[in-house]
């Protein structure tokens, strides 16, 4: 059932990275508009992106309230210029999204190597602790704040002069590795959530090499 010339949304997809979360759908609207509803923790439906002609809606503000909650959204279709109009059954056409649990499903963004510092034959490599839009006590939490020890960084490193790689891991944001004196090394990191079965790993960070800006050398 539904209003004449109004089509239901389809292909509802959550796109989420480091908790920045957007619901996307199809089709591009023709003579219709969309409104999104998302279920809160009380199972009430909250209206978002009312009367939009976009095919996406940023739901970050809602999902960061509790990243462990399992959310459901739906996209309502209305004739253009009449957001109150309903279908023959007294309701607008709508389509439900898949369920979405931010903690388990948000993609890990590409990490960044913040700095590296060499002291003798040791190098300290620091990964930037990216800020998320998740809040606690009016403060934005970092990725490490949210995931704690459930976030591991894997470091790949190799001599600039050779192809043989080594790896190390940390459940903090710092690595302390042994290097050969007088050799330049390159570094790349990857984030991993060990407890997950999908969306476990980020893409690799950009490669950073010693002898470039980010590093510091001390005897």
């Amino acid at each position: 059932s539904g209003t004449t010339n109004t089509v239901a949304a389809y292909n509802l997809t959550w796109k989420s990275t480091n908790f920045k979360t957007i619901l996307e759908w199809e089709p591009k609207p023709v003579n219709q508009v969309y409104t999104v509803q998302i279920s809160d923790r009380s199972r009430n439906w909250k209206y978002k992106c009312t009367g939009t002609t976009d095919t996406e809606c940023d739901l970050t503000d809602e999902i960061v309230k509790d990243v462990n909650w399992t959310y459901e959204a739906r996209v309502l279709s209305y004739p253009a210029g009449n957001v109150e109009s309903t279908g023959s059954a007294g309701e607008p056409l709508y389509e439900n999204s898949p369920e979405f649990t931010p903690y388990l499903e948000t993609n890990l963004g590409q990490p960044t190597i913040q700095s590296f510092e060499q002291v003798g034959t040791k190098v300290n490599v620091t990964v930037e602790d990216e800020r998320t839009l998740v809040r606690r006590n009016n403060t934005f939490l970092s990725l490490r704040d949210v995931f704690g020890k459930d976030l591991i960084y894997t470091l790949y490193y190799w001599k600039s002069s050779s192809s043989g790689k080594k790896t190390a891991k940390t459940n903090t944001n710092e690595f302390l590795i042994d290097v050969d004196k007088g050799e330049n090394y390159c570094f790349s990191v990857q984030a991993v959530i060990p407890s997950r079965t999908v969306n476990r790993k980020s893409t690799d960070s950009p490669v950073e090499c010693m002898g470039q800006e980010k590093g510091e050398f001390r005897e």
Epitope: I152, V192, P194
Partner: antibody
Framework: QVQLVESGGGVVQPGRSLRLSCKAS????????MHWVRQAPGKGLEWIGL????????IYDPKFQGRFTISADNSKNTLFLQMDSLRPEDTAVYYC??????????WGQGTPVTVSS | DIQMTQSPSSLSASVGDRVTITCKAS??????LNWYQQKPGKAPKLLIY???SLADGVPSRFSGSGSGTDYTFTISSLQPEDIATYYC?????????FGQGTKLEIT
């Protein structure tokens, strides 16, 4: 359920090559790091190396670098170990294992390789 | 490279005994240490991860402790089914290294 099944082992002459396979089911290998470990008869476990199948990054114990090559075919959900210039001391049971980053949580049953003339 | 020294290489104990195995790393491995049990002809089985955490489905008589370079694996009350070889594994940095193994027998 998660399963790893190795194959390709057997008897091979010194100096020859052998390619072992590890077929995964119940998960996508590209979501994990994957390892090869071996065990010579009556001896302990020995780590060979790992691959991140998603980006092809490989890490080896230096003693195997250059002679052994780990690769993966994500479309077939299969891990490989190419072993070249085999020696009698490479005689062992070869295991593949899945790594969740805190531990190796699943292992194959192992495939035996005998290097002998 | 990090060396793992596991001791003893073998030990004999009675049912009900408390059994302890140690692994010493040549440098700080920051608790990235696992303990595995292996029975003849079988693949290793995870018992303890991150030095102290008990793997799912593993009886509570198994435990792990330690940090830095020194780690201990304990069976609080040895059972007949615990007859196996036990290995530690450090995976904090490559090359990953196993201890030499401890073969446990019942007297």
């Amino acid at each position: 359920q998660v399963q790893l099944v190795e194959s390709g082992g057997g008897v091979v002459q010194p100096g020859r090559s052998l390619r072992l396979s590890c077929k995964a089911s119940g998960f996508n290998i590209k979501d994990y790091y994957m390892h090869w470990v071996r065990q010579a008869p009556g001896k302990g476990l020995e780590w060979i190396g790992l691959i991140d199948p998603e980006n092809g990054n490989t890490i080896y114990d230096p003693k195997f670098q250059g002679r052994f090559t780990i690769s993966a075919d994500n479309s077939k959900n299969t891990l490989f170990l190419q072993m070249d210039s085999l020696r009698p001391e490479d005689t062992a049971v070869y295991y593949c294992a899945r790594d969740n980053s805190y531990y190796f949580d699943y292992w194959g049953q192992g495939t035996p390789v005998t290097v002998s003339s | 490279d990090i060396q793992m020294t596991q001791s003893p290489s073998s030990l004999s104990a009675s049912v009900g005994d408390r059994v302890t195995i140690t692994c010493k790393a040549s440098q700080d491995i920051r608790k990235y240490l696992n303990w595995y049990q292996q029975k003849p002809g079988k693949a290793p089985k995870l018992l303890i991860y991150y030095a102290t955490s008990l793997a799912d489905g593993v009886p509570s008589r198994f435990s792990g402790s330690g940090s830095g370079t020194d780690y201990t694996f304990t069976i609080s009350s040895l059972q007949p089914e615990d007859i196996a070889t036990y290995y530690c594994l450090q995976h904090g940095e490559s090359p990953y290294t196993f201890g030499q193994g401890t073969k446990l027998e019942i007297t």
